[in-house]
């Protein structure tokens, strides 16, 4: 991704900028943005970034708040790149089954599953 | 989802069935299926289930292997339901920022980020 800093550092910096600019960002009291009901965040990246787009269009730009939205757009680029890597490599059934087993195992242990 | 057992139990059972039917599933030696390169599984659910569809269409059905694919289709239904919940609720900016902060926090600590 076109950034001098690694993605992990970019995420950390973005979290800090989010705290700094919170007051400015919540200034629009009538704005409503879709918020996922669950915490399986990776399933909702598209909606989260649509929400960020809505917020950006309603926020007075200038100073480091621009840096915040620039960072968020770089994070989106990174995630889009990861999504591309979901289907780039065509492998044999054996490898697919190993990955499927891993996926189900992760669902089993790490996903937030409602009964 | 239309199943008598909770999703968590469904996932466990599916993992067991996957082990049981491995030999049958890998019978097709020429079949190639996209396998994600990374371990951010939730980003790749669409591709994973497309792969499952490809595998199902190439597998001789009958007995408990049908149960395996039935379970996988119920898991897909559950995930599709979760994806619907990404944009069902329109909330104030404050709530959206809380969720965004949580999302970035999870990226920071739990995602598999390449440098």
């Amino acid at each position: 991704i076109p950034t001098e800093i690694p993605t992990s550092a970019l995420v950390k910096e973005t979290l800090a900028l989010l705290s700094t600019h919170r007051t400015l960002l919540i200034a629009n009291e009538t704005l409503r943005i879709p918020v996922p009901v669950h915490k399986n965040h990776q399933l909702c990246t598209e909606e989260i970034f649509q929400g960020i787009g809505t917020l950006e269009s309603q926020t007075v730009q200038g100073g480091t708040v621009e840096r915040l939205f620039k960072n968020l757009s770089l994070i989106k680029k990174y995630i889009d790149g990861q999504k591309k890597k979901c289907a780039e490599e065509r492998r044999r059934v054996n490898q697919f089954l190993d990955y499927l087993q891993e996926f189900l195992g992760v669902m089993n242990t790490e996903w937030i599953i409602e009964s | 989802i239309p199943t008598e057992i909770p999703t968590s139990a469904l996932v466990k059972e599916t993992l067991a069935l996957l082990s049981t039917h491995r030999t049958l599933l890998i019978a097709n030696e020429t079949l190639r299926i996209p396998v994600p390169v990374h371990k951010n599984h939730q980003l790749c659910t669409e591709e994973i289930f497309q792969g499952i569809g490809t595998l199902e269409s190439q597998t001789v059905q009958g007995g408990t292997v049908e149960r395996l694919f039935k379970n996988l289709s119920l898991i897909k239904k559950y995930i599709d339901g979760q994806k619907k919940k990404c944009a069902e609720e329109r909330r104030r900016v404050n709530q959206f920022l809380d969720y965004l902060q949580e999302f970035l926090g999870v990226m920071n600590t739990e995602w598999i980020i390449e440098s």
Epitope: R91, N94, Q95, D98, E102 | V35, P36, V37, H38
Partner: antibody, heavy 119, light 107 residues
């Protein structure tokens, strides 16, 4: 930087077992599979199997199934390869190697551990 | 198991020579092949993956080509540090298998 550091040389008697360690550093241990490869003196390379530290799942070359056991200790970012019922033909240098991605090429190799089986 | 047949098993060449090593798979392995260099007493080092992708830090005189069953490693201008044994590895299917190696010696 990314490194795999293996345990020192071992001398074992036929019928015994050996456990070789491979300590990972410089990256998140659970993100990459660890493969094990061996090389008998003056011979080529042979794949033993891989372990996925993310879920402890391992897969073996049929030739070693039942004799090789791959494990990990996530708390110390260490992978282990145990080989039992040793025979003289198991004398070899054993390497651990990291998968770049899921079932990809080996991007980082350990320095190797010589295991000598001799009565 | 997929058999990997490498040729030649050894070759003598001079500094500056162009060297070609081939590897043939017993079945289609797509492009899931890497080339590995090993110097005496040292750990192996991967040079090329996915048949033709050079790994970061590997000199550009190394190149790979091929797909399906036939693959080639080329060293465009042999350097003193390139004298070593080269192996191909298929990581298309389990068990992963290596070629028997090609020893590149000084003429």
């Amino acid at each position: 930087q990314v490194q795999l550091v293996q345990s020192g040389a071992e001398v074992k008697k036929p019928g015994a077992s050996v456990k070789v360690s491979c300590k990972a550093s410089g990256y998140t241990f659970t993100n990459h599979h660890i493969n094990w490869v061996r090389q008998a003196p003056g011979q080529g390379l042979e794949w033993i199997g891989y372990i996925n530290p993310y879920n402890d799942y391992s897969r073996y070359n049929q030739k070693f199934k039942g004799r090789a056991t791959l494990t990990v200790d996530k708390s110390t970012s260490t992978a282990y390869m145990e080989l039992s019922s040793l025979r003289s033909e198991d004398t070899a240098v054993y390497y651990c190697a990291r998968d770049y991605g899921n079932f990809w090429y080996f991007d980082v190799w350990g320095q190797g551990t010589l295991v000598t089986v001799s009565s | 198991d997929i058999q990997m047949t490498q040729s030649p098993s050894s070759l003598s060449a001079s500094v500056g020579d162009r060297v070609t090593i081939t590897c043939k798979a017993s079945q289609d392995i797509n492009s899931y092949l890497s080339w590995i260099q090993q110097k005496p007493g040292k750990a192996p080092k991967t040079l090329i993956h996915r048949a033709d992708r050079l790994i970061d830090g590997v000199p550009s005189r190394f190149s790979g080509s091929g797909s399906g069953q036939d693959f080639t490693l080329t060293i465009s201008s042999l350097q003193p540090e390139d004298f070593a044994t080269y192996y191909c590895l298929q990581y298309d299917d389990f068990p992963y298998t290596f070629g028997q190696g090609t020893k590149v010696e000084i003429k």
